[in-house]
Interface confidence: low
């Protein structure tokens, strides 16, 4: 296993009673220094399983705005530009962490929350169930 | 913008100096009550733009394990099961929030960090640049 030696300069921790509360610095460090976040912004239109992006806003959550992908078609777009229903457009989902204000409307107190978001769509071969 | 009325029962906030530090309850609430997180686990294989999942582990981060998608092919899989290079497999990326232990090795002190992860791949029509 990996041993994490404790840093002697850590803030004092409270006892192990739950729910456990920690200090989080909200001055976000962005590791994506060499990336252009818009570089994949046209994939939703050019994909064979295109999707629309829906804005989900919640002022009690951080980030307050999350974009949800909804596949445009049940099938996928073929070479002729038509929907081929022998294939399926499906959402690619990911669990992400958000911060939820708790108690509500408090600027300095949050709870960690996991939510499932659809990031985009991909085209898959359907699972066909043959009935005897 | 939306004004959030302050709850009188909020914990006392410190002064507004930055970096801003807040209290976060780490007993994660999971909103995905009706979802099976593994339900899309076979899309990576069934997609026309299949991908492999690479494990990225960092004990100084939460979540400590993140899975990164890497597209298997430059092209997409056609109806015959061959790679069609007239189409492109591309990663769908998303910025996510993680918690980074700061100072390092501290169990009760974190900094919010944004990282870009590839969640899966989708098949797109390539942008063709015609040279005069």
């Amino acid at each position: 296993g990996i041993t994490i030696p404790r840093n002697p300069g850590c803030p004092n921790s409270e006892d192990k009673n739950f729910p456990r509360t920690v200090m989080v610095n909200l001055n976000i460090h962005n590791r994506n220094t060499n990336t252009n976040p818009k570089r994949s912004s046209d994939y939703y239109n050019r994909s064979t399983s295109p999707w629309n992006l829906h804005r989900n806003e919640d002022p009690e959550r951080y980030p307050s705005v999350i974009w949800e992908a909804k596949c445009r078609h049940l099938g996928c777009i073929n070479a002729d530009g038509n929907v081929d229903y022998h294939m399926n457009s499906v959402p690619i989902q990911q669990e992400i962490l958000v911060l939820r204000r708790e108690p509500p409307h408090c600027p300095n107190s949050f709870r960690l929350e996991k939510i499932l978001v659809s990031v985009g769509c991909t085209c898959v071969t359907p699972i066909v169930h043959h009935v005897a | 913008g939306i004004t959030i009325p302050r709850n009188p029962g909020c914990p006392n906030s410190e002064d507004k100096n930055f970096p801003r530090t807040v209290m976060v309850n780490l007993n994660i609430h999971n909103r995905n009550t009706n979802t099976n997180p593994k339900r899309s686990s076979d899309y990576y294989n069934r997609s026309t733009s299949p991908w492999n999942l690479h494990r990225n582990e960092d004990p100084e981060r939460y979540p400590s394990v993140i899975w990164e998608a890497k597209c298997r092919h430059l092209g997409c899989i056609n109806a015959d099961g061959n790679v069609d290079y007239h189409m492109n497999s591309v990663p769908i990326q998303q910025e996510i929030l993680v918690l980074r232990r700061e100072p390092p090795h501290c169990p009760n002190s974190f900094r919010l960090e944004k990282i870009l992860v590839s969640v899966g791949c989708t098949c797109v029509t390539p942008i063709v640049h015609h040279v005069a």
Epitope: K114 | P37, S64, V65
Partner: nanobody, 122 residues
């Protein structure tokens, strides 16, 4: 946790842990152990779909399971060795990739019990 105790090498013990009141729908539950002065070691883990994984040191000897109501976690320990002597803790975290190692890595983000002592003499 309960079920700990003293046993001779080669013997068996069954640990149990009542896990109630958590809000996770997808979760990672499991057992880790610690010897004073040493690092925590993940032993076994089970996720909400029932998939199990084990540390190499206990594979084939220990079995993790939960009851039908998913409120009690068990660790059946067979063929015990002196090196299995430790304080054993059960833990639950909010899902994600579920192995004994990640259960320990992410302990700060879950709940764990007070522990039960297991002593194996040769």
């Amino acid at each position: 946790e309960s079920g700990g105790g003293s046993v001779q090498a080669g013997g068996s013990l069954r640990l149990s842990c009542a896990a109630s009141g958590y809000t996770y729908s997808s979760y990672c539950m499991g057992w880790f152990r610690q010897v004073p002065g040493k690092e925590r070691e993940g032993v076994a883990a089970i996720d909400s779909d029932g998939s199990t994984s084990y540390a190499d040191s206990v594979k084939g000897r220990f079995t993790i399971s939960e009851d039908n109501a998913k409120t009690t976690l068990f660790l059946q320990m067979n063929s015990l060795k002196p090196e299995d002597t430790a304080m054993y803790y059960c833990a639950i975290g909010g899902g994600g990739y579920c192995t004994p190692a990640t259960l320990v890595s992410d302990l700060d983000f879950g709940n764990w019990g007070r522990g039960t002592q297991v002593t194996v003499s040769s």
